[in-house]
């Protein structure tokens, strides 16, 4: 998901945008800030055991479109936002994991066992 | 043409502030970050920090932060750089400098001196 | 912080030589997103720095094809393949993927 209407075709920024990283801090990274020519992002997933774990970080540009776009993953739940307003603009995305479809319920509400399908997020 | 227009010196007492300017045109100004440099005789060049004059995002060296503060003011295209407390040590050429990802034009530099 | 390391301190050239400036980085200067940005800049007596390479060995606009940059992750070199007159001066290195971002000490070209 984009938070800034910008246009699917990714152009170069002019300069480089920080972002706040969580989870997912690369090694130039410096304080928990990383920098890049692309996006800045927050994503809200499941882990193994059905626990929703959030990171953040920064996305180059290039492949970023896609990643950004939050297309359905079979078997996962999760959402991913993107920005590039300003610097650190992924402290203020707050992602939520789709809803649950009612056939994840079918063996009762366990969740390492389910196949779990990924909704886009808006 | 891209223009970074900084005052040629200035003279400070030592403990006093100075507060160094830096005119930006030929450009849009909060397309690009302003970077200060220093450079002192055989000392080379030290990066002191850098500011998104479109959200007044700062980065500053480690070694500089409590001794350099960096502001913009839009309105004007012009960045500032303030500096306290200055001792002899702070006796410089200090330059600003458009930034994307790298470095790609100067100013001219402010020659500061710190003496009594 | 990353060291830059410069050879040599200095280099004296006769006009019409080729020169070449090392630059060593204590750490890869391989961005997260696959950039390498290091740059060459070159500083007159009495002048700021002027952009020569960026990004390891993209020419700015106004340099002179003799200049030329290469390398990866920890060391580079800018080539010089004919020295002239306003080539002399010192050229310095300088990384902006880790924060602090760092230059290197200096190479002072010179006529021999």
């Known amino acids: 998901k984009k938070e800034d209407g910008e246009s699917t075709a990714p152009t170069a920024r002019p300069k480089v945008l920080r972002c706040k990283c969580h989870h997912h801090c690369p090694e130039d990274s410096v304080n928990n800030i990383c920098s890049t020519d692309g996006y800045c992002f927050t994503m809200i997933e499941e882990d193994d055991s059905g626990t929703p774990v959030v990171t953040s970080g920064c996305l180059g540009l290039e492949g970023s479109d896609f990643q950004c776009r939050d297309t359905p993953i079979p078997h996962q739940r999760r959402s991913i936002e993107c920005c590039t307003e300003r610097n650190e603009c992924n402290k203020d995305l707050h992602p939520t994991l789709p809803p649950l479809k009612d056939r994840d319920f079918v063996d009762g509400p366990i969740h390492h066992k389910h196949h779990h399908h990924h909704h886009h997020h808006h | 043409q891209v223009q970074l227009q900084q005052p040629g010196a200035e003279l400070v007492k030592p403990g006093a502030s100075v507060k160094l300017s830096c005119k930006a045109s030929?450009?849009?100004?909060?397309?690009?970050?302003m970077q200060w440099v220093k450079q002192r005789p055989g000392q080379g060049l030290e990066w002191i920090g850098e500011?998104?004059?479109?959200?007044?995002?700062?980065l500053y060296n480690q070694k500089f932060k409590g001794k350099a503060t960096l502001t913009v003011d839009t309105s004007s295209s012009t960045a500032y750089m303030q500096l306290s407390s200055l001792t002899s040590e702070d006796s410089a050429v200090y330059y600003c400098?458009?930034?994307?990802?790298?470095?790609?034009?100067w100013g001219l530099g402010t020659t500061l001196t710190v003496s009594s | 912080d990353v060291v830059m390391t410069q050879t040599p301190l200095s280099l004296p050239v006769s006009l019409g030589d080729q020169a070449s400036i090392f630059c060593r980085s204590s750490?890869?200067?391989?961005?997260?997103?696959?950039?390498?940005?290091l740059h060459w800049y070159l500083q007159k007596p009495g002048q700021s720095p002027k952009l020569l390479i960026y990004?390891?060995?993209n020419r700015f606009s106004g340099v002179p094809d003799r200049f030329s940059g290469s390398g990866s992750g920890t060391d580079f070199t800018l080539k010089i393949s004919r020295v002239e007159a306003e080539d002399l001066g010192v050229y310095f290195c300088?990384?902006?993927?880790?924060?602090?971002?760092?230059f290197g000490s200096g190479t002072k070209l010179e006529i021999k």
């Open positions: 400098a458009r930034f994307g990802y790298y470095v790609d034009y």
């Open positions: 030929g450009y849009t100004f909060t397309s690009y970050w």
């Open positions: 500011i998104d004059p479109s959200d007044n995002y700062t």
């Open positions: 750490q890869s200067l391989v961005h997260s997103t696959g950039n390498t940005y």
């Open positions: 990004k390891v060995s």
């Open positions: 300088s990384q902006s993927t880790h924060v602090p971002f760092t």
